[in-house]
Structure formats: structure tokens, C-alpha cells
Interface confidence: low
């Protein structure tokens, strides 16, 4: 005969654990039902009655099966430099990520706490490493034979055009100017752009039972603005 299914609340066998989506209530000393995501425990269980769950109120949520007496508050509204990539619902927190042209200078478990504008390399400097969702642009001086005449977070140093007859030699911030006869070869017919980082929703993972890889270690104090690196501009 199949074993009888116990209905909550029930006393667990010594040494055994409660089943999935149940928790052990020490006061009742019974296995009781957890509340589903989007709900919270309105009344805790007793020896004879199971947990009473209720829906989360507006602007609050529970993401996991739980027995919390109050739902968690959704995070504050996204700032002007952010995009809301996940709305606050009864089952999930709001997630804010950085808008295009910005990167996440201070991340949190999900989304971004502090966005900063991507560095722009000034003329004479090109992008050595493009910005990503979580890292700033790195600029480098244009090497001999290359130039950048833009203030940009995407343009790299481009080779000078090669002239039959040079009217004005190129430098780090200006292309060579040829005499009226056309150049023999152009190394760079147009500006070379690096792909702009696109802020996408960070992949959500369920919190593990040890979130200290999250809360206890992942929160950092926001740092003040750092001085612009050489070859960069705050524009």
C-alpha cells in the first residue's frame, strides 16, 4: 500500500525534514505550509490549523516560497540614468539597469545601485577597451601613424591616410591632409566604432541558502567620482 500523504500541519518523524514548500514551526512543532511567491504569512500555523497566507500589498513582494509576516518592499524607483528592466510586482522586485552610454559603477544582487557615464576619449586618444555593462571605457594615446579627432566613448585610433604628396602631416588628433591628388590608399575610409554596451537585465538567480556571497559581502559603499583618467573627458 502506498504511504499515507500527511496534510499540513503534521508532526515530522524524528530526524526527518519537512517537505518542499513546507517549514518547521517551532512553536507548533509541526510542519506547516509556506506561502507562495506574491503572498506572506498572515497567521502562523498552530497544531490544528495551517498557515494563513495573504497577498502582498502594492509596492511589496515575495519572490520565494516563504513564511514572512510582511512582504518585502520593492526598491526605489529607477533614477534618470537607469532603465527599469523589471517592474515591481507582487512576486518580484524592481530591477534597474544603466541606460545606454552608462555603465554600472556599483552593482547589487540584481541590477545596478549606481550608474556612471562611460568615459569619452578626447582627440588624440582612442578606445583601448570598450565599456561594458559593468566597466568603464579605457582610453589610450593614439600611436604614431594613427589618430582620433573625436570625443567619443566608442571611436578607436584610426590609421592616417597615406598620401602621394602630403600637404599637412597627420598627428595623434588629426588625419594627414593630402595634396589635391587623391591618396594612394586609405587605411580608414570612415570612423571605426566599437559596439556600444547594451544594458540588459542581469540574469536572475534564485538566492541560495547562504546569501553571504550576496548580502554580507556584496554591498559596497558608493565611491565618489574619480578624477578622469588621462585622455578622457567627463563631457
Amino acid at each position: 500500500l502506498p504511504a499515507q500523504v500527511a496534510f499540513t500541519p503534521y508532526a515530522p518523524e524524528p530526524g526527518s525534514t519537512c517537505r518542499l514548500r513546507e517549514y518547521y514551526d517551532q512553536t507548533a512543532q509541526m510542519c506547516c505550509s509556506k506561502c507562495s511567491p506574491g503572498q506572506h504569512a498572515k497567521v502562523f500555523c498552530t497544531k490544528t490549523s495551517d498557515t494563513v497566507c495573504d497577498s502582498c500589498e502594492d509596492s511589496t513582494y515575495t519572490q520565494l516560497w516563504n513564511w514572512v509576516p510582511e512582504c518585502l518592499s520593492c526598491g526605489s524607483r529607477c533614477s534618470s540614468d537607469q532603465v527599469e528592466t523589471q517592474a515591481c510586482t507582487r512576486e518580484q522586485n524592481r530591477i534597474c539597469t544603466c541606460r545606454p552610454g552608462w555603465y554600472c559603477a556599483l552593482s547589487k544582487q540584481e541590477g545596478c545601485r549606481l550608474c556612471a557615464p562611460l568615459r569619452k576619449c578626447r582627440p588624440g586618444f582612442g578606445v583601448a577597451r570598450p565599456g561594458t555593462e559593468t566597466s568603464d571605457v579605457v582610453c589610450k594615446p593614439c600611436a604614431p601613424g594613427t589618430f582620433s579627432n573625436t570625443t567619443s566613448s566608442t571611436d578607436i585610433c584610426r590609421p592616417h591616410q597615406i598620401c602621394n604628396v602630403v600637404a599637412i602631416p597627420g598627428n595623434a588628433s588629426m588625419d594627414a591632409v593630402c595634396t589635391s591628388t587623391s591618396p594612394t590608399r586609405s587605411m580608414a575610409p570612415g570612423a571605426v566604432h566599437l559596439p556600444q554596451p547594451v544594458s540588459t537585465r542581469s540574469q536572475h538567480t534564485q538566492p541560495t541558502p547562504e546569501p553571504s556571497t550576496a548580502p554580507s559581502t556584496s554591498f559596497l559603499l558608493p565611491m565618489g567620482p574619480s578624477p578622469p583618467a588621462e585622455g578622457s573627458t567627463g563631457d
Epitope: C18, D25, Q26, W67, P69, L72, P215, F219
Partner: antibody
């Protein structure tokens, strides 16, 4: 840096009152964390005082010995936790620790402690 | 409130020894038990929660076991930095705080 800093400790006479503060920094002191006080008398073990749920108005839970004399409150706008202690006795002399506890079912129990503030009750 | 009884209250051991500390709850606390390490003048540090889950950054020589009322903390090979006082704590999270987060009396591990 993520930290809790207690203040307000000192010497107080028996029967007197004292309010301890705990300033939280480096993390969001909203209703995702619920905060507790633990004390430790000189040379003795740890003793749980009580906890407050994340919402400003409670609820609060206390050790039986603390009920009636000790009150825990919080000001989320100031990222600060308080412990109001009344009718103090010599046996309340201890280092008082502020402790952060995760409020949901993630197992993040008592994972962040302040450095403690010493309260001495003596005439 | 739940009472937590820890034993021994102190023990002497040498580096490399296997050390076992026990903790007994006055009623069943399922697996809602944490262990802490405290060094003189410092705040406690969490080692283990849910009776057997190692907290982040804690060396694997620490382990916990037990369920219900009887729990054990084991240090498989004692290191010089492990000489400290250890506390157990009944800690069932959300609704457990209706009846307390009692600590055990502590076990002081001293150099033999």
C-alpha cells in the same frame, strides 16, 4: 564598507535610563533586514535581547527578561536602530551589540555585528 | 524562551586535535541552529547556520551536525587561530523570533 556602529553607551546609575543607537552603513536599511540587539556581560556569554522587524512600527520580539524595560525601535530614514533601556540594574552592565539579520528565508542569520558599546550600571 | 545547553564549558586541546562541542535545546528546533566563534575583545563571527551549512569564507575544517534537540560542532584539525570561545544559538529566522534566539553558555577552547 558594510558596517554597524553602536553608540550611546557609558556609565549610568541604577534605576536610570539610556538609549543606545546603531548606525548602519554600506547596505540598504530597508525592510529587507531585520535588526537585533545582543549583549555580553564582562567575562560572560552572549545573551539575546530582542529583534525588530523591518517596518518602522515593528513588530518587536524580546527575551523574557527584557520585556517591559527594554524597547527596540528603528528609523529607516536615518539607517539607525535604537535600544531604549529603562530601570537599569547592575546586572545590565554589558557590551551591547547591534546585529543584522536577514528577514526572509535565505538563512542569513546574525551575519553582521557591530563592534559593541559598553554600558556600565553603577552608583 | 528556549534554553540552550552547551558542553563542555571549556576544553584544552593542541594544534591538530579534533575538537567536538555539543549543544542541546530544551525543545526541538529542527535544524535552526547557528554556531559562532568569538575572540577576546571582538564581536562574534558566524561559522555555521542551518545546523550544518558552512558560512561563506569559513574553513572546511569546521563542520556542524544534528537536528531536533542535539547538535555538534566539530573542528577536524585545530589550528592556532581556532583558539577562541564558541557559541551555539537557536535561530529559526522569521517566525522563530516569537520565542527567542537563545545562545548557549559558550565553550572556551584553550591551548593545552
Amino acid at each position: 564598507e558594510v558596517q554597524l556602529v553602536e553608540s550611546g553607551g557609558g556609565l549610568v546609575q541604577p534605576g536610570g535610563s539610556l538609549r543606545l543607537s546603531c548606525a548602519a552603513s554600506g547596505f540598504s536599511f530597508t525592510n529587507n533586514y531585520y535588526m537585533c540587539w545582543v549583549r555580553q556581560a564582562p567575562g560572560k556569554g552572549l545573551e539575546w535581547v530582542g529583534c525588530i522587524y523591518p517596518s518602522i512600527v515593528g513588530p518587536t520580539y524580546y527575551a523574557n527578561w527584557a520585556k517591559g524595560r527594554f524597547t527596540i525601535s528603528r528609523d529607516n530614514s536615518k539607517n539607525t536602530l535604537y535600544l531604549q533601556m529603562n530601570s537599569l540594574r547592575a546586572e545590565d552592565t554589558a557590551v551591547y551589540y547591534c546585529v543584522r539579520d536577514r528577514y526572509d528565508d535565505y538563512g542569513d542569520y546574525f551575519n553582521l555585528w557591530g563592534q559593541g558599546t559598553l554600558v556600565t550600571v553603577s552608583s | 524562551d528556549i534554553q540552550m545547553t552547551q558542553s563542555p564549558s571549556s576544553l584544552s586541546a593542541s594544534v591538530g586535535d579534533r575538537v567536538t562541542i555539543t549543544c542541546q535545546a530544551s525543545q526541538s528546533i529542527y535544524n535552526y541552529l547557528s554556531w559562532y566563534q568569538q575572540k577576546p575583545g571582538k564581536a562574534p563571527k558566524r561559522l555555521i547556520y542551518y545546523a550544518s551549512t558552512l558560512a561563506s569564507g569559513v574553513p572546511s575544517r569546521f563542520s556542524g551536525s544534528g537536528s531536533g534537540t542535539d547538535f555538534t560542532l566539530t573542528i577536524s584539525s585545530l589550528q592556532p587561530e581556532d583558539f577562541a570561545t564558541y557559541y551555539c544559538q537557536s535561530n529559526s529566522g522569521v517566525n522563530g523570533n516569537r520565542y527567542g534566539n537563545a545562545f548557549g553558555g559558550g565553550t572556551k577552547v584553550e591551548i593545552k
